[in-house]
Interface confidence: low
């Protein structure tokens, strides 16, 4: 019996087609993805093949103005229109709190939403009961397939699930659910979830009875043969893991941002064992036409977005200096504003010992693309912020050793004075440079804000200590020459859309007046 699994993950609000790098579509003839194009391909496969499942491995929420404005209603509407069969909860589904998940998505979705390792307690337990499930059995042709869900147990550090949801260890939580499915005579089981490729492989290895793992969170691109675009494969598609009980378990993921549709064909024997698996992600490029009815619907929903981008989010009473002449050479107040917003967006008081789990921010000055003039009645709009942060990136959480941070700050000024983008803006960090010293030895003082303290204060950076830092995904991926971050990071979790972080902060503060306050000094 053959099953076709179509899958997406980490779509992050890319409802419209995007450019090749998943930013805003500029030249339509070269754009990719989007739900209208995805629908065309899904329908084509549904017509051609008998047993098809369309699955999503989480993180539909967060990433563009679509989510900012519609807050998840757009996800439910268009996933319903595409007739998804199931979705796993990702960490970003909790970005607007549990209410922001329940009302727009859980109550509106016409497909099961899954996670076996999230347990509700207290008053929330009854409120959320039945709105998401640990697993779902789906009839496919003449057979049944069990789908069991999972979500990153780091979600409390990455999003806003509140105190009434407990995120358990994935493997511990999945095993009894799979065992339960087995008792229901379900012998074809897919683990669908959002914990990253390393955890996906562990689940394939450790959870008895899981036949296939469909993952997300790490934006992993797998491909067999010559890849069709710029993404470099992390391995073959599917990635085969040998389980502890000797089975070959295919593991798949489909990069991110709706650029690809994962396409996996599985052949099962009559006992539900996987005989063969093959496939590849399908690049959703302009050779695939956008479905006209979905496209028309997108255009209808779009109108509200255009109105939103010119509305006032808040006010500034000072000039927000985002000029290259400032932000690539010295501390600039736009850099301070953005870093303050990044830290504010990551306030998670999860432990009495720590006032917060993270206190530090770094931001490449080259990522700040425009100032904002206060003389326009102080008004700040989404449109203004889009000029400052035009690349559609995210502000991510990483864990780094102090020694890596020191290298990053040396890199920040290794060729100082050439108006290059790697000069770092900061938050929760005091750095002093001596430019008379040779490159690689210019950081003379580097103090960081403590987290394990009731009164935050600045202490010297310790080389062997592991620190959490918020930074742009561009830096986490080694951009602007920050190879040491990419090579040495100990953990990397994708965060919220950059503009959304800053706009939320400005809306919250109402009036802002960031200063240049001595975070970066030259001796």
């Amino acid at each position: 019996w053959e099953l076709t699994i179509l899958h997406t993950n980490d779509v992050h609000s890319r409802l419209e087609q995007t450019s090749e790098d998943s930013s805003k579509c500029v030249n339509a003839s070269r754009c990719m993805g989007g739900v209208a194009r995805l629908f065309t391909k899904v329908q084509q496969i549904r017509r051609a093949e008998p047993n098809v499942l369309l699955l999503d491995a989480g993180d539909q929420y967060q990433g563009t103005i679509w989510f900012t404005v519609y807050k998840g209603a757009e996800v439910a509407h268009f996933m319903n229109a595409l007739r998804y069969d199931a979705m796993a909860l990702g960490n970003h589904e909790f970005d607007n709190g549990v209410e922001g998940l329940i009302e727009p998505l859980l109550k509106e979705a016409k497909f099961p939403i899954l996670s076996a390792n999230i347990k509700a307690k207290g008053p929330l337990a009854s409120q959320i009961s039945g709105l998401y499930l640990p697993y779902k059995v789906l009839p496919v042709g003449d057979e049944v397939v069990g789908i069991v869900g999972y979500t990153s147990k780091e979600t409390p550090f990455l999003s806003n699930p509140g105190t009434n949801l407990v995120f358990e260890d994935e493997i511990t939580a999945l095993q009894p659910e799979v065992d339960k499915l087995k008792t229901l005579n379900v012998n074809k089981i897919i683990a669908l979830g959002h914990s990253g490729f390393e955890m996906d492989k562990l689940i394939a290895q450790k959870v008895r009875g899981v036949d296939v793992v469909v993952g997300g969170h790490s934006n992993t691109f797998l491909y067999t043969g010559n890849p069709p675009s710029k993404e470099v494969p992390a391995g073959k598609y599917p990635f085969i893991v040998t389980s502890d009980d000797g089975r070959k378990v295919p593991v798949v993921q489909a990069y991110a941002f709706g650029k690809y549709l994962g396409y996996l064909k599985i052949e099962f024997d009559e006992r539900g064992n996987v005989i063969s698996s093959h496939g590849n992600p399908i690049l959703l490029n302009s050779s695939i036409p956008e479905d006209p009815s979905i496209k028309a619907d997108i255009n209808k929903w779009r109108i509200k977005l255009d109105n939103y981008s010119t509305q006032e989010l808040g006010k500034t009473i000072v000039y927000l200096d985002g000029s290259s002449q400032s932000c690539r050479f010295r501390e600039c107040n736009m850099g301070n504003l953005i870093c303050d917003a990044m830290i504010n967006n990551n306030l998670r008081h999860t432990d009495e010992m720590f006032w917060n789990h993270v206190s530090m921010c770094i931001l490449n000055g080259g990522g700040i693309r425009s100032p904002i003039d206060e003389r326009n009645n102080g008004t700040i709009t989404w449109e203004n912020l889009a000029a400052v942060l035009p690349f559609g990136g995210t502000f991510d959480l990483v864990q780094l050793k102090g020694s890596t941070l020191k290298k990053a700050f040396e890199h920040s000024v290794h060729r100082y004075g050439q108006s290059t983008g790697e000069f770092l803006q900061v938050g929760g960090i005091h750095v002093v440079y001596d430019l008379s010293r040779k490159p690689g030895d210019r950081v003379v003082k580097l103090d960081v804000l403590c987290t394990k303290c009731r009164v935050p204060s600045y202490d010297p950076l310790k080389m062997d200590e592991v620190y959490k830092v918020i930074l742009p995904n561009f830096l986490a991926n080694g951009g602007d020459g920050f190879q040491m971050i990419k090579d040495e990071l100990l953990r990397h979790d994708s965060g919220d859309q950059d503009i959304n972080v800053v706009s939320t902060y400005i809306s919250k503060m109402k009036v802002i007046y960031p200063a240049v306050e001595g975070r970066i000094k030259f001796s």
Partner: antibody, heavy 119, light 107 residues
């Protein structure tokens, strides 16, 4: 489509100065750098410097500081390069080229201005 | 300054050949590398930026690769119109510098 039109060939005496022009069209002049590049058979292609018309910011190759002076006239979308105290070593083809402010590769080039310094 | 070295200034090639041109930087340039084609009497023409990104209108027989200090331009099947001089250029550190060029000549 961007287009860069350079001034015609020049024959000048040693010790004199020359000012060549590069008129841009087909794009927003103030949002890209104008770079100047020297080409000789002996030295190949050498970057002289760049000017950003948006704010007048100039960066020079140290080798050409004192030799080349870059200016722009935003009203006519024209960039200029003046070369002073000319010697036979300055005989070359000089190109202007457009480049992004951050990523300085040159996507559109002028046709070149041939400068001959001879008595 | 970063030196860009293109080994051997001229190549004797045949039409239909696969041609590989190399370019070595004196230090790491973090993939900030462009390739240009220049024909006699003309300005250089940008072929590739960012090591691998083909400019619009550049035939797909051209491709770029490399990282760190070592980069390559490949032409899969040389056509008459490809006979030209090819230059690499780094745009990582000011002053931006070019290689000495590789001149392709038909043998």
């Amino acid at each position: 489509q961007a287009y860069l039109q350079q001034s015609g060939a020049a024959l000048v005496r040693p010790g004199a100065s020359v000012k060549m022009s590069c008129k841009s069209s087909g794009y927003t002049f103030t949002t890209y750098n104008i770079h100047w590049v020297k080409q000789t058979p002996r030295q190949g292609l050498e970057w002289i410097g760049a000017i950003f018309p948006g704010n007048g910011h100039i960066s020079y190759n140290q080798k050409f500081k004192g030799k080349a002076t870059l200016t722009v006239d935003k009203s006519s979308n024209t960039a200029y390069m003046q070369l002073s105290s000319l010697t036979s070593e300055d005989s070359a083809v000089y190109f202007c080229a457009r480049g992004d402010y951050d990523e300085s590769y040159f996507d559109y080039w002028g046709q070149g201005t041939t400068l001959t310094v001879s008595s | 300054d970063i030196q860009m070295t293109q080994s051997s200034s001229s190549f004797s090639v045949s039409l239909g050949d696969r041609v590989t041109l190399s370019c070595k930087a004196s230090e790491g340039i973090y993939n900030r590398l462009a390739w240009y084609q220049q024909k006699p009497g003309n300005a250089p023409r940008l072929l590739i930026s960012g090591v691998i990104s083909l400019e619009t209108g550049v035939p797909s027989r051209f491709s770029g690769s490399g990282s760190g200090k070592d980069y390559t331009l490949s032409i899969t099947s040389l056509q008459t119109e490809d006979v030209a001089t090819y230059y690499c250029q780094q745009y990582w550190s000011i002053p931006w510098t070019f290689g000495g060029g590789n001149k392709l000549e038909i043998n």
